[in-house]
Interface confidence: low
């Protein structure tokens, strides 16, 4: 399977909400011994590999923001902790998963990574990630709503095997 990032750049005004999205593509095993773990974290564009550094989003780690379920089941974070920080991660039946960030500030600008780990219990694991940039702007040059820029076909499938 692969992870696609439909948009590589989100440009938003301060105070707005934004939903960053990734999509799981390709064949997904729905067997009982297979679980998918999806999460989000901040990173920086490393020289060797994007998303290799894992930093918290608004002080919440990837562990706080994770989703886990079999196959394409829907899931979302209901944790008070995430919601208190204006965050919610969610996943639907079609392989889309997202993180919603409310009331954006300039400090939210940066590189965001989605990560999927497929675990075949007691056997193997496979992980893929996607990256996207969030720019939060203020002042007269800021857009009135979030503007999203589609990924190039090359960027939209960012594959990292375990």
């Amino acid at each position: 399977f692969k992870v696609a990032t439909p948009y590589s750049l989100y440009v938003c005004p301060e105070g707005q909400n934004v939903t960053l999205t990734c999509r799981l593509l390709g064949p997904v095993d729905k067997g009982h011994d297979v679980t998918f773990y999806k999460t989000w974290y901040r990173s920086s564009r490393g020289e060797v590999q994007t998303c290799s550094e894992r930093r918290p989003i608004r002080n919440l780690t990837f562990q706080d923001l994770h989703l886990h379920h079999g196959g394409h089941q829907a899931a979302n974070t209901s944790h008070d902790l995430a919601q208190r920080h204006g965050l919610e991660s969610a996943s639907d039946h079609h392989g889309n998963f997202s993180i919603t960030m409310r009331n954006l500030t300039l400090l939210d600008s940066g590189l965001y990574c989605c990560l999927v780990v497929e675990i075949r219990h007691h056997h193997s694991e496979h992980r893929v990630h996607g990256a996207m940039e969030l720019q939060v702007q203020t002042g007269k040059d800021a857009p009135s709503n979030c503007v999203v820029y589609p990924s190039s076909s090359q960027d939209s499938e960012n594959i990292t095997a375990a």
Partner: antibody
Framework: QVQLVQSGAEVKKPGSSVKVSCKAS????????ISWVRQAPGQGLEWMGG????????NYAQKFQGRVTITADESTSTAYMELSSLRSEDTAVYYC?????????????WGQGTLVTVSS | DIQMTQSPSSLSASVGDRVTITCRAS??????LNWYQQKPGKAPKLLIY???SLQSGVPSRFSGSGSGTDFTLTISSLQPEDFATYYC?????????FGQGTKVEIK
């Protein structure tokens, strides 16, 4: 069958450090959270922190922040817990425990425990 | 941190008795509640996860129920090997926290 085998008992002086190891065998190591839980004599269970080896970053209970370091070596399927500035109240059995499903935090596999005694 | 409170802290029962242990969380934890059994000198053993799911290999006389803040572990017919200490644990958010334990003793 998954097994977690911990290092042997330790006797330490107050102010020193101890490093306990937990070697996993029989299953995928990297994607499962390994936590450390301690139990003082006659007391209940206390979670110290955990790590998911593929990430390498650990999550600690506030009580132990700054004193505990949890690491994992994927090449040897071994997790480590180091506790510094030991005091007598750190005398306890230290368990490593593995989550049953990746990043969930219920523990279906436990090490046998390592008794750490802090005494001058 | 989420506080977990178990009751009773100890109880005396006879073989064949129905035993109920309760666990209360200081805030809603949905169904992120696990139960463990521990015998002296041994590591804890997972009995119930996700409030009501029986762990593989655990006898069906053990059952769990509840959601939100109030949870129950029930042993339908106490067996000699069930005399032990039982702990609840929330896995809703870190730091993970355990109840103080309930010791089940022979009457």
């Amino acid at each position: 069958q998954v097994q977690l085998v911990q290092s042997g008992a330790e006797v330490k002086k107050p102010g020193s450090s101890v490093k306990v190891s937990c070697k996993a065998s029989g299953g995928t190591f990297s994607s499962y959270a390994i936590s450390w839980v301690r139990q003082a004599p006659g007391q209940g269970l206390e979670w110290m922190g955990g790590i998911i080896p593929i990430f390498g970053t650990a999550n600690y209970a506030q009580k132990f922040q700054g004193r505990v370091t949890i690491t994992a070596d994927e090449s040897t399927s071994t997790a480590y817990m180091e506790l510094s500035s030991l005091r007598s109240e750190d005398t306890a059995v230290y368990y490593c425990a593995r989550s049953s499903y990746g990043w969930s935090y219920e523990f279906d596999y436990w090490g046998q425990g390592t008794l750490v005694t802090v005494s001058s | 941190d989420i506080q977990m409170t178990q009751s009773p802290s100890s109880l005396s029962a006879s073989v064949g008795d129905r035993v109920t242990i309760t666990c209360r969380a200081s805030q809603s934890i949905s169904s992120y509640l696990n139960w463990y059994q521990q015998k002296p000198g041994k590591a804890p053993k997972l009995l119930i996860y996700a409030a009501s799911s029986l762990q593989s290999g655990v006898p069906s006389r053990f059952s769990g129920s509840g959601s939100g803040t109030d949870f129950t572990l029930t042993i339908s017919s106490l067996q000699p090997e069930d005399f032990a200490t039982y702990y609840c644990q929330q896995s809703y958010s870190t730091p993970l926290t355990f109840g103080q334990g309930t010791k089940v003793e022979i009457k």
